[in-house]
């Protein structure tokens, strides 16, 4: 079954994810043609090769072509149309570049794995969490409440329906006695008295009904602000916390549908109470009294239901998606000068009336006083159309919306004025978009507004990881959406919120956080031995003070070791098998009453690129305590050469009489090596025959490979502390024992 | 209790400028739309401008049009009207007034501002 | 823009008297209109708005009527307190809005 096919299966909520990874520049069009060809392709490839990526681009174009001819032979006009659209698009994005488009086709694809993984976790938790439960009665609860609040308007429908004929009926009545009155013949005095006294009573009536309806709409309208305070001050206020948290790689945050539908049967509700006033007012047009409780009421009414709509309509204007650069989907709100970004505004009160009727209007740092209060703060313009209205049409679950795909920032450059000179650096200066529209109609004239989540603006891509910080810090710490001088002063962070956050960057990118040990680990990096959950963290030790005595920040060297597994390590991480974090002290804790040979993955410390080394142990030399020996670490420079199972699979150590061995024998905690990474090893080239030394392309050259050798026994060393790298003294020390050119050969290990 | 505050009145010369304020309390300011109504001596009532509640429309009769600038900072509560170029014609009190429901009625007005444009 | 004319532009009633002021639109404004009562030296005051709506705390004996583009302020009596200048609204569209000339009422 196609990962397409199954993503079509999913619950709407999930669905909307997928929605969001589409936009202009990939469409989704191509994914649905397409998709059982897009799925076979080696996208990862594609997108680290430019010919290969050239390749797969003109394959695609062809494959487009083909889809065309099937259109063309089913006479399916509007699908050749849309093809030869997408065709063109694909070719004015993406012939420069090929690689762009591997890459978001490759990023698609993994999100939709990804997708796919929480639906299926999330329908697990379903059958037996807590928190779900409590999710599901709160919604419940709401239900209950806005279709109380439609009912109470249907009631009122019909009580205004009786009032009406009641009143037509007592008008009636009075013309009636008053013609007969008026008849020169006259009516017997009793007979008159009788239908005076009826009359009588049927005003009583009727000031009753109108009494009673007035009532009525009050409760309503009590009902109603009871129910919308809790749409808008709890329901929508967490959905945009944990919108927040989804953005720094939290769990998928809730669609939006189900808020949508409530929001929007309120504001019906509303509208026809506007409809239910205007009626009754007619009414009071007709027949009127002293004490009127139409007159006495009506203006009350009117004012709370349009303050009512009005508060409903304002605070339904969202930001659906945050911006987000189309190549970084994992990293929203860090935008790139001159590089695209996509953003989405959703109205909840899905009106058919307000189809077409909004025209928003994006920009950029509006009413932010840190432009005029931060020294240096930068200014910026933005390119692209401004201004885009909402509809049912472009959206693929019919919701109002407006998606901004092509927006890009310049920064203002003021002449003689140096930008770095302020109290923060770029990626901490905090920025705004701003979106602005109005409902305008007869008897309502609304200004909607709302802000994106706090981005930074980076100018080259190295400021990235810097960038992806401040957006870290701030969405894990600030609730409310705009404090954009956050970082002159940044909280501390506790290590349980830190803790889940650093959790949700490994999880977010590949199927696995970290765990508890490995959290242990790092908490004792940033706050020493004594780590504990409500340990404060200061922003400069996350980012920007070295960790320990090594030259670059925790979250640097957490960032490259992130880009490591992504790149060269994901389905070793994925399967649990890199250990990763653990300090030194552990491992040995774990490793020394293991069999020889035993050995576990581990990142480097000590290397600021990103870099995965094995340790493992073995039986000393003098019957005491076992030896550990670690390999120096493999950054992304050996790892592009050799993947790390091959290395596993053939790494050597020179042992006695120079017999090269593989010491490592058993995973941690006892998985044979072969079964934990066989199925990653490369498949053995066909050996070619021994005639045959060109090989099928005939280049004159035998296959070689590469492997890891240590050529000095590690035992020889002693402990894994005097393992590569080293700080200078160090090196000094074991070049005197081992011997300068024993020591360059050992170095060399690939 | 609603209330509205006009500040800022005074003599000036032809060509010269102004700068109305109009203070509010009592009500939710960032609701509602605003307006300035100005009234010549033993004239009528003139609109002269109104702004929506987020200032993100703006609207000015003919006669101002291109030399008024009316603007509103909502978390200070006040609106405000900047007068320049101004003629011997807009010599007249100036009211601002509150624009509320459906019915964009203005239903709570200010004690008036006077403007004198004389030489 | 939507022109207001109003009529008469002043009269002369007697405490107790029905008066009748008149609004009429240059075209259909529905029941977007709003009429004020201005005494000398003071603030306009809100009497109706939507055509026929009493304001709150307005008397009953002050009433609005009509729609679309002929519209009518009854004082069904005349009270001492209600001699003052009275204007009708237009909020249709209410950017601009537009103001009649306004009817002087005077004693009699």
């Known amino acids: 079954m196609s990962q397409w096919y199954e993503l079509q299966q999913l619950d709407s909520k999930f669905l909307e994810q997928v929605h969001q990874l589409y936009d202009d520049s990939f469409p989704m069009e191509i994914r649905q043609y397409l998709a059982q060809w897009l799925e076979k392709q080696d996208w990862e490839h594609a997108a680290n090769d430019v010919s290969f990526a050239t390749i797969r681009f003109h394959d695609l174009l062809s494959q487009l072509d083909d889809q065309y001819s099937r259109f063309s032979l089913e006479n399916n006009f509007l699908l050749q149309h849309n093809i030869r659209k997408s065709k063109r698009n694909l070719q004015d994005n993406f012939q420069e570049d090929p690689i762009q488009m591997s890459m978001i086709i490759y990023s698609c694809l993994k999100e939709e794995r990804k997708i796919l993984e929480n639906a299926q976790r999330f329908n697990q938790a379903q059958s037996g969490n807590i928190q779900s439960t409590v999710m599901l009665d709160k919604q419940k609860e709401l239900d209950s409440k806005v279709r109380n609040v439609k009912d109470k308007v249907m009631c009122i429908e019909h009580e205004i329906k009786s009032l009406e004929d009641l009143q037509d009926e007592y008008d009636f009545k009075c013309k009636t006695l008053q013609n007969r009155e008026h008849e020169t013949n006259g009516v017997a005095k009793s007979d008159q008295k009788q239908e005076q006294l009826l009359l009588k009573k049927m005003y009583l009536m009727l000031d009753n009904k109108r009494k009673e309806v007035v009532h009525k709409i009050i409760e309503l309208l009590n009902v109603t602000e009871l129910t919308q305070n809790a749409l808008i001050n709890d329901e929508l206020v967490e959905w945009k916390r944990r919108q927040q948290s989804a953005c720094i790689g939290g769990p998928p945050n809730a669609c939006l549908d189900q808020l949508q539908n409530w929001f929007t049967i309120v504001a019906e509700s509303l509208q026809q109470v506007r409809q239910q006033l205007k009626k009754l007012e007619e009414l009071e047009q007709k027949y009127t009294y002293e004490h009127d409780p139409i007159t006495k009421n009506k203006q009350v009414l009117w004012d709370r239901t349009f303050s009512l709509f009005q508060q409903l309509i304002q605070s339904s204007f969202v930001v659906e998606r945050q911006p987000c650069m189309p190549t970084h989907p994992q990293r929203p709100l860090v935008l790139k000068t001159g590089v695209q970004f996509t953003v989405k505004l959703r109205l909840l009160v899905k009106l058919q009336e307000l189809n077409y009727n909004l025209k928003v209007k994006v920009l950029f740092d509006k009413d932010v006083n840190e432009r005029n209060t931060v020294k240096g703060f930068r200014k910026f313009n933005i390119l692209g159309t401004h201004t885009k209205v909402m509809n049912m049409e472009e959206s693929t679950n019919g919701s109002l919306a407006a998606e901004f795909r092509h927006l890009q920032l310049k920064e203002q450059k003021n002449a003689g004025t140096r930008t770095n000179e302020g109290p923060l650096i770029v990626t901490e200066e905090l920025h705004s978009l701003s979106f602005e529209t109005q409902l305008c109609q007869p008897g309502l004239v609304i200004d909607l507004e709302t802000t994106s989540l706090p981005v930074v603006v980076i100018s080259n891509v190295s400021q990235l990881p810097s960038g992806w910080a401040s957006i870290l810090w701030y969405n894990m710490l600030v609730a409310e959406p705009r404090n954009l001088s956050f970082f002159l002063t940044p909280p501390c962070a506790r290590w349980a919120q830190l803790s889940e956050v650093l959790s949700w960057q490994f999880s977010s990118v590949t199927k696995r956080g970290l765990n508890v040990d490995q959290l242990n680990m790092l908490g004792e990096k940033l706050l020493g031995p004594n780590a504990s959950p409500d340990g404060l963290i200061p922003w400069t030790r996350f980012c920007k003070e070295n960790i320990n005595d090594k030259n670059f920040p925790f979250w640097l060297w957490i960032e490259s070791i992130l880009e490591l597994i992504k790149k060269h390590l994901l389905p070793l991480w994925n399967d649990g098998c890199i250990m990763g974090f653990i300090s030194k002290e552990r491992e040995r804790a774990l490793l020394k009453d293991q069999q020889p040979g035993t050995f576990l993955l581990r990142f480097s410390e000590s290397s600021r690129e990103g870099a995965i080394t094995f340790t493992w142990v073995e039986r000393s030399q003098n019957g005491g305590e076992p030896d550990f020996h670690a390999v120096e670490p493999y950054t992304k420079k050996e790892l592009s050469a050799v993947t790390f199972p091959d290395i596993i699979r053939n790494y050597k150590v020179m042992a006695a009489e120079n017999i090269p061995e593989n010491p490592l024998k058993y995973l941690y905690p006892n998985i044979d090596k072969d079964h934990a990474f066989g199925k990653y090893y490369s498949r053995p080239k066909e050996a070619p025959e021994p005639m045959e030394l060109d090989g099928p392309k005939g280049t004159g050259y035998i296959k070689t490979e590469l492997i890891s050798v240590s050529e000095v026994h590690p035992s020889r060393l002693q402990t894994t502390d005097n393992l590569l790298p080293m700080s200078p003294e160090e090196f000094d020390e074991v070049s005197r024992i081992v011997g300068s050119v024993e020591f360059d050969s050992m170095m060399n290990t690939v | 209790e609603v209330q509205l505050l006009e500040s800022g009145g005074g003599l000036v010369q032809p060509g010269g400028s102004l700068r109305l304020s109009c203070a509010a309390s009592g009500f939710t300011f960032s609701y509602s739309s605003m307006y300035w109504v100005r009234q010549a001596p033993g004239k009528g009532l003139e609109w002269v401008s109104s702004?929506?509640?987020?200032?993100?429309?703006?609207y000015y009769a003919d006669s101002v049009k291109g030399r008024f600038t009316i603007s509103r900072d909502n978390s200070k509560n006040t609106l405000y009207l900047q007068m320049n170029s101004l003629r011997a014609e807009d010599t007249a009190v100036y009211y601002c007034?509150?624009?509320?429901?459906?019915?964009?009625?203005?239903?709570?007005w200010g004690q008036g501002t006077l403007v004198t444009v004389s030489s | 823009d939507i022109q207001m004319t109003q009529s008469p532009s002043s009269l002369s009633a007697s405490v107790g008297d029905r008066v009748t002021i008149t609004c009429r639109a240059s075209q259909s404004i529905s029941s977007y209109l709003n009429w004020y009562q201005q005494k000398p030296g003071k603030a306009p005051k809100l009497l109706i708005y939507?055509?026929?709506s009493l304001q709150s705390g307005v008397p009953s004996r002050f009433s609005g009527s009509g729609s679309g583009t002929d519209f009518t302020l009854t004082i069904s009596s005349l009270q001492p307190e209600d001699f003052a200048t009275y204007y009708c609204?237009?909020?249709?569209?209410?950017?601009?809005?537009?103001f009649g000339q306004g009817t002087k009422l005077e004693i009699k």
């Open positions: 609204q237009q909020t249709w569209h209410p950017y601009p809005s537009t």
């Open positions: 939507a055509a026929s």
């Open positions: 007034a509150r624009s509320w429901g459906y019915y964009h009625y203005l239903d709570y």
């Open positions: 702004i929506s509640s987020y200032g993100h429309s703006t």
